[in-house]
């Protein structure tokens, strides 16, 4: 049985290329260790953007060079993706795995469409 995972349908990145969204899962058990993976789907290709395993009540720890950061609160994970450009526009899918204790559960959200608009370059001023 798949675990239910909810995430917003659409998010607009800010002018600095940062987008944030909440990934919420309906935990069937009392998980102590959870793995969250962000996948990007574009042109029927799915690639892993970032992943983190965290202990319940602790911070998410992504790799040092990751473009993702996040915090957790209960069954919610607040994810932030940085350094986005217009070409990164796409569907970002949240995958949650309850790694421990057993049994293992996994759920995949429907995805959040993140729109990224590159900022216009500032015109030269004559002042």
């Amino acid at each position: 049985k798949a675990m239910h995972v909810a995430q917003p349908a659409v998010v607009l990145a800010n002018s600095r290329g940062t987008a944030s969204f909440v990934c919420e899962y309906a935990s069937p058990g009392k998980a102590t260790e959870v793995r969250v993976t962000v996948l990007r789907q574009a042109d029927s290709q799915v690639t892993e953007v970032c992943a983190a395993t965290y202990m319940m009540g602790n911070e998410l720890t992504f790799l040092d060079d990751s473009i993702c950061t996040g915090t957790s609160s209960g069954n919610q994970v607040n994810l932030t993706i940085q350094g986005l450009r217009a070409m990164d526009t796409g569907l970002y899918i949240c995958k949650v795995e309850l790694m421990y204790p057993p049994p293992y559960y996994m759920g995949i959200g429907n995805g959040t469409q993140i729109y990224v608009i590159d900022p216009e370059p500032c015109p030269d001023s004559d002042f």
Partner: antibody, heavy 122, light 112 residues
């Protein structure tokens, strides 16, 4: 081939210590939680301890709590069970097992080692 | 004493169908999957059924599992002499300090 190989068993006196090892091969060890299960001579299976894939979470049966510790070294693909203050009732065959999963499915303990015998006697 | 209850023994003749039961409670079988393991004499246990009724690759379809409420059962049809072994049910329990619980095991004897 997916394989688990236990070692470190033997004869030890009551109150003594022993460290069991379980070497994994043929799969991505760091992706799986692991367990130790024991079987006393002529008896059934008893779950002893479990550890998450990262090593950050552990559990123990009440019968061994405070005496046994479980750990893993993902760089060496090895699981450990440190057994202290051993008692005669700890005499058993000790198995390590992988807690499997695939897709959405929990697969239970899908890979077992051949076991290592621990005998506690004076 | 085991958390899950199994009959200590079962028997049948070659070709027969044999069923082994496993009884638990709402905190284990009632709210979790059931797994079955086969232990042939002198060997390590082997996963036979996972997720109540699924067979890993390589396990013959003569073996089938089912669950209803707080009980589960393993059925072996077309019994063979090589099926003589100990069979253990297993589940997870949310109310205990350790998450894994086993049945006491059932010794299956193939007669004749």
């Amino acid at each position: 081939e997916v394989q688990l190989l236990e070692s470190g068993g033997g004869l030890v006196q009551p109150g003594g210590s022993l460290r069991l090892s379980c070497a994994a091969s043929g799969f991505t060890f760091k992706a799986y939680s692991m367990s130790w299960i024991r079987q006393a001579p002529g008896k059934g299976l008893e779950w002893v301890s479990g550890i998450s894939n990262t090593g950050g979470s552990t559990d123990f049966a009440d019968s061994v709590k405070g005496r046994f510790t479980i750990s893993r070294d993902n760089s060496k693909n090895t699981l450990y069970l440190q057994m202290n203050s051993l008692r005669a009732e700890d005499t058993a065959m000790y198995y390590c097992a992988r807690l499997g999963y695939s897709g959405y499915d929990d697969r239970g303990m899908d890979v077992w080692g051949q076991g290592t015998l621990v005998t506690v006697s004076s | 004493q085991s958390v899950l209850t199994q009959p200590p023994s079962a028997s049948g003749t070659p070709g027969q169908r044999v069923t082994i039961s496993c009884s638990g409670s709402s905190s284990n079988i009632g709210s979790n999957y059931v797994y079955w393991y086969q232990q042939l004499p002198g060997t390590a246990p082997k996963l036979l059924i996972y997720g109540n009724s699924n067979r890993p690759s390589g396990v013959p379809d003569r073996f089938s599992g089912s669950k209803s409420g707080t009980s589960a059962s393993l059925a072996i049809s077309g019994l063979r002499s090589e099926d003589e072994a100990d069979y253990y049910c297993q589940s997870y329990d949310s109310s205990l300090s350790g998450p894994v619980v086993f049945g006491g095991g059932t010794k299956l004897t193939v007669l004749g």
